[in-house]
């Protein structure tokens, strides 16, 4: 791993829970500089493996709302606009970090949690399984 | 919004920075019980809009390593295995939360940061055949 020289201006870490419990500033800094994150918002409809977006809400989680993609078809849309079952629509999944209130209902105490979300769908060539 | 009844066992929040600064337990709880995140690991190669995965490392960020998708082609792979430029390979992007060390190099003090990552690629019908 990379060793980081410690900044002498760091907050005190003599807590008995350190290093498991850290201080986090919730004022979000947005690093998305050159592109518009809303730009790709129509891909779910224009893709050859289109998807629907479902709202997943949980007030005990931060962010409380996460959108989950569900592929519309088993196959993919061909040039004629029909579903081609020789190809497969599959979800692209990503593990993301969220904050879970812990203990529950506490406004200022959280635990990191890793969840798997489906972000969108892509069209893949199927793996053919021949029955042995 | 949803009002959450406060748990009387919550940590003390009489900090002058509250509610902007919260305590976070970094012992990650993994909610990915039912599915194998590695399951979709070959989609990048089998997709009609294939992508490569590039390692993005930043020791000042948590998680320090994020894998970013980079579409291989401008067009999409057709049934003959050739690139069809009448279709567009595009990245599926997602805004995710990460923790940024703040002040820099501090092991126990972070700020939430929102970054846009490319998770994979999908094949879309173009709105225009050339950049409009």
């Amino acid at each position: 791993g990379i060793t980081i020289p410690r900044n002498p201006g760091c907050p005190n870490s003599e807590d008995k829970n350190f290093p498991r419990t850290v201080m986090v500033n919730l004022n979000i800094h947005n690093r998305n500089t050159n592109t518009n994150p809303k730009r790709s918002s129509d891909y779910y409809n224009r893709s050859t493996s289109p998807w629907n977006l479902h709202r997943n809400e949980d007030p005990e989680r931060y962010p409380s709302v996460i959108w989950e993609a569900k592929c519309r078809h088993l196959g993919c849309i061909n040039a004629d606009g029909n579903v081609d079952y020789h190809m497969n629509s599959v979800p692209i999944q990503q593990e993301i970090l969220v904050l879970r209130r812990e203990p529950p209902h506490c406004p200022n105490s959280f635990r990191l949690e890793k969840i798997l979300v489906s972000v969108g769908c892509t069209c893949v060539t199927p793996i053919v399984h021949h029955v042995a | 919004g949803i009002t959450i009844p406060r748990n009387p066992g919550c940590p003390n929040s009489e900090d002058k920075n509250f509610p902007r600064t919260v305590m976070v337990n970094l012992n990650i709880h993994n909610r990915n019980t039912n599915t194998n995140p590695k399951r979709s690991s070959d989609y990048y190669n089998r997709s009609t809009s294939p992508w490569n995965l590039h390692r993005n490392e930043d020791p000042e960020r948590y998680p320090s390593v994020i894998w970013e998708a980079k579409c291989r082609h401008l067009g999409c792979i057709n049934a003959d295995g050739n690139v069809d430029y009448h279709m567009n390979s595009v990245p599926i992007q997602q805004e995710i939360l990460v923790l940024r060390r703040e002040p820099p190099h501090c092991p126990n003090s972070f700020r939430l940061e929102k970054i846009l990552v490319s998770v994979g690629c999908t094949c879309v019908t173009p709105i225009v055949h050339h950049v409009a």
């Epitope: - | 401008l74 990552v117 173009p126």
Partner: nanobody, 123 residues
Framework: QVQLVESGGGLVQAGGSLRLSCAAS????????MGWFRQAPGKEREFVAA????????KYADSVKDRFTMSRDNAKKQVYLEMNSLKPEDTAVYYC????????????????WGQGIQVTVSS
């Protein structure tokens, strides 16, 4: 912050050739395509050519097809535009830029551009 520096323009006679270069730095890890664009006096900026960083596959505007060739050098993070059989209507300021959505990129997706490089074709 993305930085784009174009070079290689100038004045050339119709039928002549020029080679433009573009050095790009600060690109996103996920950057997968680069493009050349141009803006003639009194006209809107238009797409000229695009290239995939990974495959090297290219796409050209109909007006430059078979005359212009785009290439890239991944190690140097540079792209090039070889322009042959130049015509007076190719006169414009030429720009390069990252294409964050490949061929789906639109002009209004961009927040900033480089300075561009003047190409003048005299008859």
């Amino acid at each position: 912050q993305v930085q784009l520096v174009e070079s290689g323009g100038g004045l050339v006679q119709a039928g002549g050739s020029l080679r433009l270069s573009c050095a790009a730095s600060g690109l996103a890890v996920s950057s997968y395509a680069m493009g050349w664009f141009r803006q003639a006096p009194g006209k809107e900026r238009e797409f000229v050519a695009a290239i995939s960083w990974i495959s090297g596959g290219t796409k050209y505007a109909d007006s430059v097809k078979d005359r212009f060739t785009m290439s890239r050098d991944n190690a140097k993070k540079q792209v090039y535009l070889e322009m042959n059989s130049l015509k007076p209507e190719d006169t414009a300021v030429y720009y390069c830029n990252d294409m964050p959505y490949g061929l789906d990129t639109r002009m209004d997706d961009y927040k900033y551009w480089g300075q561009g490089i003047q190409v003048t074709v005299s008859s």
